[in-house]
Interface confidence: low
């Protein structure tokens, strides 16, 4: 691949895993035992973007699928979606901004801020089995902190 990537899984700070919910949506729920195999494996690509010491621009693709998390406006609201791309052209170093997230590491936890919509973060609900979404608040009810687990390629 033309861009450096690593394979990983993500869990929110309540240890909920991310799984596919239909063809174009992720949901967060607690998994145990063999059910852990359901969790999605991301191919996290390190891409160009506006970066600083604590913000690293990444793209989050689903491993071996031509799907990437992207941020778009729907009904005037920043929205998280899974977008299908041409696998011949992705991943690439200079990803379109809607695919880029600023990976922010704080106290061994990760936040993923939309590069397209600053201060909007990949979020999960406190409730079980709810969609992963783009949220505009930190520190409230919704969860914006994640941990990353390295997966061998």
């Amino acid at each position: 691949a033309p861009v450096r990537s690593l394979n990983c899984t993500l869990r929110d700070s309540q240890q909920k895993s991310l799984v596919m919910s239909g063809p174009y949506e992720l949901k967060a729920l607690h998994l145990q035992g063999q059910d852990m195999e359901q969790q999605v494996v991301f191919s996290m690509s390190f891409v160009q973007g506006e970066e600083s010491n604590d913000k690293i621009p990444v793209a989050l693709g689903l491993k071996e699928k031509n799907l990437y998390l992207s941020c778009v406006l729907k009904d005037d609201k920043p929205t998280l979606q899974l977008e299908s791309v041409d696998p011949k052209n992705y991943p690439k170093k200079k990803m379109e901004k809607r695919f880029v997230f600023n990976k922010i590491e704080i106290n061994n936890k990760l936040e993923f801020e939309s590069a397209q919509f600053p201060n909007w973060y990949i979020s999960t609900s406190q409730a079980e089995n709810m969609p992963v979404f783009l949220g505009g608040t930190k520190g409230g009810q919704d969860i914006t902190d994640f941990t990353m687990q390295f997966v061998s390629s």
Epitope: F46, N53, K93
Partner: antibody
Framework: EVQLVESGGGLVKPGRSLRLSCTGS????????LNWFRQAPGMGLEWVGF??????????EYAASVKGRFTISRDDSKSIAYLQMNSLKTEDTAVYYC???????????????????WGQGTTVTVSS | SYELTQPPSVSVSPGQTASITCSGD??????ACWYQQKPGQSPVLVIY???KRPSGIPERFSGSNSGNTATLTISGTQAMDEADYYC?????????FGGGTKLTVL
């Protein structure tokens, strides 16, 4: 001061083994990916392999020319990385360097684009 | 396997601008970096992630990368810049170096 020091080089016969050490100081050793490179006399730089930091499983990658013969490991409690070289060949004769990924890149992926701290190198001569 | 090609030598007069190129297939889609190595010394990183300069590297060093070519530019070249320069990129979890360019300051 951030520093890496290689040791363990010397003269060895073809087919034999040698273990090089890379000792770090002045930084949190376990957080960083570490590389081994080599440079044959009068030649350019050649990558040997690297080991990722603990956050990324300490996994390794190797150049095709050494895969299966060389093994990289690390002992973060001692701030040492090792290069175990088996079945040495005359073409493995070189100065061997270890280095550390760029500070800026540490939190991104534990291996990044560029190495900002290099050791002074240790010479390995494989000859009968 | 992926290859990076550099000119074996480049000459420049003091105070002039030196450009060292590094070519590889779709190199602009990868991150490139550059190392300076003086005789008997370890390499020194001068440019990483195409354009970034580590602390302590003079501003006269700059980098660019697009298409199939990465370029290291040294403006206002000084005698102390005479050295070998190596480009480096990533390809499929491996590190690839160019063959090196000897910069001579006339």
């Amino acid at each position: 001061e951030v520093q890496l020091v290689e040791s363990g080089g010397g003269l060895v016969k073809p087919g034999r083994s040698l273990r090089l050490s890379c000792t770090g100081s002045g930084f949190t050793f376990g957080d960083y990916a570490l590389n081994w490179f080599r440079q044959a006399p009068g030649m350019g730089l050649e990558w040997v392999g690297f080991i990722r930091g603990k956050a990324y499983g300490g996994t390794t990658e190797y150049a095709a020319s050494v895969k299966g013969r060389f093994t990289i490991s690390r002992d973060d409690s001692k701030s040492i990385a090792y290069l175990q070289m088996n079945s040495l060949k005359t073409e493995d004769t070189a100065v061997y360097y270890c280095n550390r990924e760029v500070e800026y890149c540490r939190s991104s992926e534990n291996y990044c684009y560029g190495m900002d701290v290099w050791g002074q190198g240790t010479t390995v001569t494989v000859s009968s | 396997s992926y290859e990076l090609t550099q000119p074996p030598s480049v000459s420049v007069s003091p105070g002039q601008t030196a450009s060292i190129t590094c070519s590889g297939d779709k190199l602009g889609d990868k991150f490139a970096c550059w190392y300076q190595q003086k005789p008997g010394q370890s390499p020194v990183l001068v440019i990483y992630q195409d354009t970034k300069r580590p602390s302590g590297i003079p501003e006269r060093f700059s980098g660019s990368n697009s298409g199939n070519t990465a370029t290291l530019t040294i403006s206002g070249t000084q005698a102390m810049d005479e050295a070998d320069y190596y480009c480096q990129a990533w390809d499929s979890n491996t590190v690839v170096f160019g063959g090196g360019t000897k910069l001579t300051v006339l």
